[in-house]
């Protein structure tokens, strides 16, 4: 069902004009008619789904609110080009408080940025550059601070397996001053929307609404969320069946936690609890030593029915990840555990996201991991 594509095209065509002035109305009505046409085209395959009916009713409401006629010109969807660098897409009246770097410079030097990522089976890179492989089945808090909350749901990659991967991701951007209303972003397997759950693509109706915005980089596969009011960039991808998450966030925001007992336990900050960690390096060493296809002693789970021989896994991972760092080792582990070649891409893109988001270029590759206590 392609209704989300219609939603994205409509929001793209009308971004920055929630309540267009009367002289904007013809253009807005043209965009609405295009939206209506798009939804009609999806009727056959979407007619039974909530998203379709929400769109249809939303269009009817907007048509009547703006006195749009059903007949008339339609608009061409805008080409999805990347926004230029800088703040050209932000409203000129966006208050300074809604641009983290500008407001931060008033009382300090350039902020220190940190990175956290979750990908594959899943592998976690914390804000302090610890690298862990975790079980964490079910719903877990990835980030929980005063500004946003990120929760992931991990499901077993194979029946009876301890190895899991991320099947659902929920991000709640909390209401913040005159910048943004509370916004919720939700992605699931085979549903990577380029909009918040309310259909919008920015922070709402406040002055600084465009200090939070979603950009679709690759339809259904790659979304970027910029939250400039907290100096934060989030990258969400669907790779194969599962989701990956990466974030760049200032230390000040990372540590903006009021209740350390409850909030401070989140995975990106503290890592996975010890009983949830998998010693994948031992697995890797065992695999290398034996070359065996099934490594029950070291494996965290029943091996996949169609896993790769060790040599094949190594070759496939080397192809995408020539540096034998922890991302490469994670790739090998995932192929041996799941037999799903898409995990190679998950590790590759996770490293690409580190290159884009990590502020310390000397720490792109991690080579050693200590299975230490969280915290």
């Amino acid at each position: 069902c392609k209704i989300l594509k219609c939603n994205s095209e409509f929001w793209s065509a009308t971004s920055g004009s929630h309540a267009p002035a009367s002289d904007d109305t013809p253009e807005f009505c043209a965009a609405l008619r295009s939206y209506a046409l798009c939804t009609r085209r999806t009727a056959r395959t979407c007619r039974g789904d909530l998203a379709y009916h929400s769109a249809v009713h939303g269009i009817e409401d907007l048509m009547s609110q703006h006195n749009c006629s059903k007949d008339g010109p339609t608009s061409q969807p805008r080409l999805r080009t990347l926004p230029p660098a800088g703040d050209s897409q932000e409203r000129s009246d966006s208050p300074e408080i809604c641009h983290y770097e500008k407001s931060f410079h008033k009382h300090s030097a350039t902020p220190n940025y940190t990175h956290c990522g979750l990908f594959g089976d899943p592998h976690l890179r914390t804000f302090t550059d610890r690298f862990q492989t975790c079980k964490v089945q079910g719903a877990w808090p990835l980030i929980d601070n005063n500004y946003l909350n990120v929760q992931v749901t991990n499901t077993p990659v194979l029946p009876g397996s301890a190895a899991t991967a991320t099947s659902k991701l929920t991000i709640i951007f909390k209401n913040f001053q005159e910048c943004v209303d509370q916004k919720v972003y939700q992605a699931e397997m085979d549903e990577l929307p380029a909009a918040f759950v309310d259909g919008s693509k920015n922070g709402g109706d406040k002055h600084g609404a465009n200090s939070l915005k979603i950009t679709e980089k690759v339809s259904g596969q790659h979304v970027e969320i910029q939250a400039k009011y907290i100096g934060t960039t989030i990258v969400v991808r669907q790779v194969g069946r599962y989701l990956t998450f990466a974030v760049r966030m200032p230390e000040e925001v990372v540590n903006a936690v009021e209740d350390w007992d409850s909030q401070g336990l989140y995975l990106c900050l503290r890592g996975c609890p010890l009983n949830q960690q998998i010693d994948f390096q031992a697995f890797h060493t065992n695999a290398e030593g034996t070359g065996a296809r099934r490594l029950a002693a070291a494996s965290p789970a029943p091996t996949a029915p169609e896993t790769f021989p060790y040599e094949t896994a190594v070759a496939k991972c080397k192809e995408k990840l020539p540096v034998e760092d922890l991302y490469y080792q994670a790739c090998v582990f995932d192929l041996l555990t799941t037999g799903d070649v898409n995990f190679t891409l998950a590790a590759y893109y996770a490293l690409e996201d580190v290159k884009m988001l990590h502020s310390n270029k000397d720490k792109l590759h991690l080579y050693e991991r200590t299975r230490d206590l969280p915290g």
């Epitope: 085209r41 056959r44 395959t45 007619r47 909530l50 998203a51 009916h53 549903e191």
Partner: antibody
Framework: EVQLVESGGGLVQPGSSLKLSCVAS????????MNWIRQAPKKGLEWIGM????????HYADSVKGRFTISRDNSKNTLYLEMNSLRSEDTAIYYC????????WGQGVMVTVSS | DVVLTQTPVSLSVTLGDQASMSCRSS???????????LEWFLQKPGQSPQLLIY???NRFSGVPDRFIGSGSGTDFTLKISRVEPEDLGVYYC?????????FGSGTKLEIK
């Protein structure tokens, strides 16, 4: 991971009734239309019918119209197929599938109608 | 009802070779503005069907790029560029343009 698990199948006599269930997980069940599809032994696939996300509309194949009823309970993430006046030609594996047009399918449940 | 006729009924190919199968509809499957709701499913032995291709040529999530769907109107083709062992099973075409929704009778792919 999207999972659909059918249950309630078995051996019944012609003319009797049976109610199948399909429990969904791994996606927001209440957002999606759902389908029932069947496959007679050693035969191809036959679409039975579909139900909208909110039960507002239901569509059926002519072969089951008036005898089969599709329903759902969104609070329980469960889809149902109530089958009345069963005939021998209704013997099949019954699958539930997610979406207005099916993408993910359950593993199926066998229904045998025989005297 | 729309009748979908699949040919051949069975197909035996060597691993690594190309396989091609056809699905012909009794009426046009074009819905509106060029949208054509024809899908392809694969049912592997002992398993439930899995979606491969939707809207004639779009690969579903996780489907390898060796599966190529094409066609328009009433004639559709599924090609597998390099057949692998896991590709064996029965391939069904399916149309969602007209009610009732209908399946083709299937093409069985076997490995030589």
């Amino acid at each position: 991971e999207v999972q659909l698990v059918e249950s309630g199948g078995g051996l019944v006599q012609p003319g009797s009734s049976l109610k199948l269930s399909c429990v969904a997980s791994g996606f927001t069940f209440s957002n999606y239309g759902m389908n029932w599809i069947r496959q007679a032994p050693k035969k191809g696939l036959e679409w039975i019918g579909m139900i909208y996300y909110d039960s507002s509309e239901k569509h059926y194949a002519d072969s089951v119209k008036g005898r089969f009823t599709i329903s759902r309970d969104n609070s329980k993430n469960t889809l149902y197929l109530e089958m009345n006046s069963l005939r021998s030609e209704d013997t099949a594996i019954y699958y539930c599938a997610k979406g207005t047009t099916p993408d993910y399918w359950g593993q199926g449940v066998m229904v045998t109608v025989s005297s | 009802d729309v009748v979908l006729t699949q040919t051949p009924v069975s197909l035996s190919v060597t691993l690594g070779d190309q396989a091609s199968m056809s699905c012909r509809s009794s009426q046009s499957l074009e819905y509106s503005d060029g949208y054509t709701f024809l899908e392809w499913f694969l049912q592997k032995p002992g398993q439930s069907p899995q979606l491969l291709i939707y809207e004639v040529s779009n690969r579903f999530s996780g489907v390898p790029d060796r599966f190529i769907g094409s066609g328009s109107g009433t004639d559709f083709t599924l090609k597998i560029s390099r057949v692998e062992p896991e590709d064996l099973g029965v391939y069904y075409c399916f149309q969602a343009t007209h009610d009732p929704l209908t399946f083709g009778s299937g093409t069985k792919l076997e490995i030589k």
